[in-house]
C-alpha cells in the first residue's frame, strides 16, 4: 500500500478522490501507481509546476468544480499515459500555451464551463490523438483558423454556449473524422458555404439557439452521414429548395422556433430514416400537397403553434408510418375530409386550440388505430354522425371548450359519449353553449325530454357504440391510456450535459405520449 493523503479516499490505491472545501492545493503524497485522480469541489485556485510528477501512470484526471483560475504551463508534465483530462467547471480565463504538451495519449479533453475568452492553434497542436474536445459554456467569441487543424482524429467537438458570432469556413476543414459538432447557444447569424464540407463523417450537428437567418443551399451537401440536425430556435425564414436533399441518413430534424412561413413540396428529402420532424412555433400558414411525401418513415410530426389556416388534401401524402400528428394552436377553420386518409397508422392527433366549426364525417375514415383525439377549444357545435364509429382503440377524446349546441341533434353524440365513457378517460366534460336554457349544463346530463328540437330533419341517425363487442365484456375503467407528460422540445440527448430539462408543458406537444427519441 502506497499511502493516501488524509483529505482523499483511495480505493485499491489506483483510484483516488479528493474532495472538500478545506483542500487548497493538490494533496500529497499521491500513490505513485494511481490510475484515476479526481479533485472535486475544492478551493484550489491554481495548479503549479508538476504537482503530478510522481504519478506518471495516471490515465484519468478530473479537476472539476473548483476555484481554479490559473495553471502553470508545466502543470501536467510527466503524464504521458493520460487519456482523459477534465478541467470543467472552474474559473479558467486563459490557457497557457504548451499546457497540454507531452500528453501524447490524451483522447478526451474537457474544458467546458469555464471563462475562456480565446483559444489558439498552439493550444491543441500537440494533441494529435484527441478524440473529444469539450469547450462549451465558455466566453469564446471567435475560433481562429487552424485552431483544430492538428486534431485529425477528433470525433466530438462541443463549442456550444459560447459567444461565437461567426465561423470561418476553414475552421473545421481538417476534421474528417468528426462525428458530433455542437455549436448550439451561440450568436451565429449565418454559416458560410463550405463550412461543413470537410465533415464527411458527421453524424450530429447542433446549431439550435443561434440567430441564423439564412441557410446556404449547399450547406449540408457533403454531410451524407448526418443523422441528427438541430436547427431550432433560430431566425430561419425560408428553406432553400435543395438544402436537405443530400441527407439520406437523417433521423432527427428540429426546426421549431424559427420564422418559417411556408414549406415547399419536396423540401424534406429524400430522408428515408427521418422519424421525427419538429416544426412548432413557426409562422407557417398553409401546407401544400406532398410537402412531406419523401418522409416515408416519419412517426412524429409536430406542426403546432403556427398560423396554419389551410391544409391541402394531399399535404400528408406518403406519411404511412406516422403515429403522432400535432396541429394544435393554429388557425384551422375547416378540414378536407380526405386530409388524414393516408395516415393509416396514426395513433394520436391533436387539433385543439383552432377555429374548427365542423368536421367532415369521413375525417377519420381510414385512421382506424386512433387512440387519442384532442378537439378541445374549437368552435364545434356538433359532430357528424358516426364520426368515431370505427375507432375501436380510441381511449382519449377531449371535446371540452367548444360551443356545443344541445338541441335534439346532439343526442347521437351524447349517447356515444355515455355508452363509451369507460374508454374515454376522465377529462373535463363537454358543456352545452346553446340554447340558452341549457347553457353551462354538461352535455351528457342534459334532460333529453326538454332538448330543443332541431331545425333539421326530425329523424336523426345515431352513433353506434364503438367498438361493438358482442362476445366480450365491456372495457374496464382502467382503459384510459397514457401519461400526458409532454415535452417542450425534443431531448437533444447530449451525454455531456449534466441535466436535461423536461417539463410538463402541455402547450407544445398536445400529445399523449412524450417522445424523447
Amino acid at each position: 500500500y502506497h499511502g493516501c493523503p488524509s483529505e482523499c479516499t483511495c480505493s485499491r490505491a489506483s483510484q483516488v478522490e479528493c474532495t472538500g472545501a478545506r483542500i487548497v492545493a493538490v494533496p500529497t503524497p499521491l500513490p505513485w501507481n494511481a490510475m484515476s485522480l479526481q479533485i472535486l469541489n475544492t478551493h484550489i485556485t491554481e495548479l503549479n509546476e508538476s504537482p503530478f510528477l510522481n504519478i506518471s501512470a495516471l490515465i484519468a484526471l478530473r479537476i472539476e468544480k473548483n476555484e481554479l483560475s490559473r495553471i502553470t504551463p508545466g502543470a501536467f508534465r510527466n503524464l504521458g499515459s493520460l487519456r482523459y483530462l477534465s478541467l470543467a467547471n472552474n474559473k479558467l480565463q486563459v490557457l497557457p500555451i504548451g499546457l497540454f504538451q507531452g500528453l501524447d495519449s490524451l483522447e478526451s479533453l474537457l474544458l467546458s464551463s469555464n471563462q475562456l475568452l480565446q483559444i489558439q492553434p498552439a493550444h491543441f497542436s500537440q494533441c494529435s490523438n484527441l478524440k473529444e474536445l469539450q469547450l462549451h459554456g465558455n466566453h469564446l467569441e471567435y475560433i481562429p483558423d487552424g485552431a483544430f487543424d492538428h486534431l485529425v482524429g477528433l470525433t466530438k467537438l462541443n463549442l456550444g454556449k459560447n459567444s461565437l458570432t461567426h465561423i470561418s469556413p476553414r475552421v473545421f476543414q481538417h476534421l474528417g473524422n468528426l462525428q458530433v459538432l455542437r455549436l448550439y447557444e451561440n450568436r451565429l447569424t449565418d454559416i458560410p458555404m463550405g463550412t461543413f464540407d470537410g465533415l464527411v463523417n458527421l453524424q450530429e450537428l447542433a446549431l439550435q439557439q443561434n440567430q441564423i437567418g439564412l441557410l446556404s443551399p449547399g450547406l449540408f451537401h457533403n454531410n451524407h452521414n448526418l443523422q441528427r440536425l438541430y436547427l431550432s430556435n433560430n431566425h430561419i425564414s425560408q428553406l432553400p429548395p435543395s438544402v436537405f436533399m443530400q441527407l439520406p441518413q437523417l433521423n432527427r430534424l428540429t426546426l421549431f422556433g424559427n420564422s418559417l412561413k411556408e414549406l415547399s413540396p419536396g423540401i424534406f428529402g429524400p430522408m428515408p430514416n427521418l422519424r421525427e420532424l419538429w416544426l412548432y412555433d413557426n409562422h407557417i400558414s398553409s401546407l401544400p400537397d406532398n410537402v412531406f411525401s419523401n418522409l416515408r418513415q416519419l412517426q412524429v410530426l409536430i406542426l403546432s403553434r403556427n398560423q396554419i389556416s389551410f391544409i391541402s388534401p394531399g399535404a400528408f401524402n406518403g406519411l404511412t408510418e406516422l403515429r403522432e400528428l400535432s396541429l394544435h394552436t393554429n388557425a384551422l377553420q375547416d378540414l378536407d375530409g380526405n386530409v388524414f386518409r393516408m395516415l393509416a397508422n396514426l395513433q394520436n392527433i391533436s387539433l385543439q386550440n383552432n377555429r374548427l366549426r365542423q368536421l367532415p364525417g369521413n375525417i377519420f375514415a381510414n385512421v382506424n388505430g386512433l387512440m387519442a383525439i384532442q378537439l378541445q377549444n374549437n368552435q364545434l357545435e356538433n359532430l357528424p354522425l358516426g364520426i368515431f364509429d370505427h375507432l375501436g382503440k380510441l381511449c382519449e377524446l377531449r371535446l371540452y371548450d367548444n360551443p356545443w349546441r344541445c338541441d335534439s341533434d346532439i343526442l347521437p353524440l351524447r349517447n356515444w359519449l355515455l355508452l363509451n365513457q369507460p374508454r374515454l378517460g376522465t377529462d373535463t366534460v363537454p358543456v352545452c353553449f346553446s340554447p340558452a336554457n341549457v347553457r353551462g349544463q354538461s352535455l351528457i346530463i342534459i334532460n333529453v325530454n326538454v332538448a330543443v328540437p332541431s331545425v333539421h330533419v326530425p329523424e336523426v341517425p345515431s352513433y353506434p357504440e364503438t367498438p361493438w363487442y358482442p362476445d366480450t365484456p365491456s372495457y374496464p375503467d382502467t382503459t384510459s391510456v397514457s401519461s400526458t407528460t409532454e415535452l417542450t422540445s425534443p431531448v437533444e440527448d447530449y451525454t455531456d450535459l449534466t441535466t436535461i430539462q423536461v417539463t410538463d408543458d402541455r402547450s407544445v406537444w398536445g400529445m399523449t405520449q412524450a417522445q424523447s427519441g
Partner: antibody, heavy 113, light 111 residues
Framework: QVQLVQSGAEVKKPGASVKVSCKAS????????IHWVRQAPGQGLEWISY??????KYNERFRGRVTMTRDTSTSTVYMELSSLRSEDTAVYYC????????WGQGTLVTVSS | DIVMTQSPDSLAVSLGERATINCRAS??????????MNWYQQKPGQPPKLLIY???NQGSGVPDRFSGSGSGTDFTLTISSLQAEDVAVYYC?????????FGGGTKVEIK
Amino acid sequence: QVQLVQSGAEVKKPGASVKVSCKASGYTFTSFVIHWVRQAPGQGLEWISYIYNDGTKYNERFRGRVTMTRDTSTSTVYMELSSLRSEDTAVYYCARDYYFDYWGQGTLVTVSS
Amino acid sequence: DIVMTQSPDSLAVSLGERATINCRASESVDYYGISFMNWYQQKPGQPPKLLIYAASNQGSGVPDRFSGSGSGTDFTLTISSLQAEDVAVYYCQQSKEVPYTFGGGTKVEIK
C-alpha cells in the same frame, strides 16, 4: 308522448325460447338506447342488455342466451332469451335512454314444466 | 361488477317527515367529474320510474321533494316531506359501466 308498449305475457317450458317485443312511439326511435331489465317475483331489478343502432352490449350472465334486435321500420325492439329455465321466470321490461327515463309496462314470462 | 348496497331495507316515516335512503357502490361511479348514479321509484304492479339521474338531476315531472346527493361511492336519496303517494320501493343504480347494476331496493312506508 313517449310510449313503450310491450307484447303480452308468455308461458314457456324449460329449454324453450321466448321473444318479447317493445314498440316505441312519440320520439325519434334511432336517437335513443333501449335497455332490457328483468324482475323476478318479489325480487329486485337486473339489467340484461341494451341495443343502440344495431349494436348491443350484454350482461355476461346472459351472454349466449340473449339476443337483441330491432326493426326501425316499425320502431320495435326484440329481446329473445333461449334455453329457458325456471329461474328466468320474471317480468321483463324495456326502458329507453341511457338513464332509463321511460319504461314499458312489462311482460311476464313464466317458465314452467 | 360494481355491487350496489342499499340501506335500510325498509323505512317507515310519518307523513310530512324526511325520508333518507343510502346507497353505496363497491367502487367509484364517477366519470368526467359526474357521478353515474340513478334512482328509481317502483310502485306495486307498475314499472320503475326515473326519479334522479347522474346523482342529483331530477327526471322529467319529478316533484321537487325528491333530491339526490353524493359522489364517488356514497349516495343519498332524500324525500324532504313524505307524501302518501310516495309509498313504493326505491332502487339505486350505477350506469358507469356495463353491467349496469341495481341496489336491492328500499321499501318506504308510512308510519
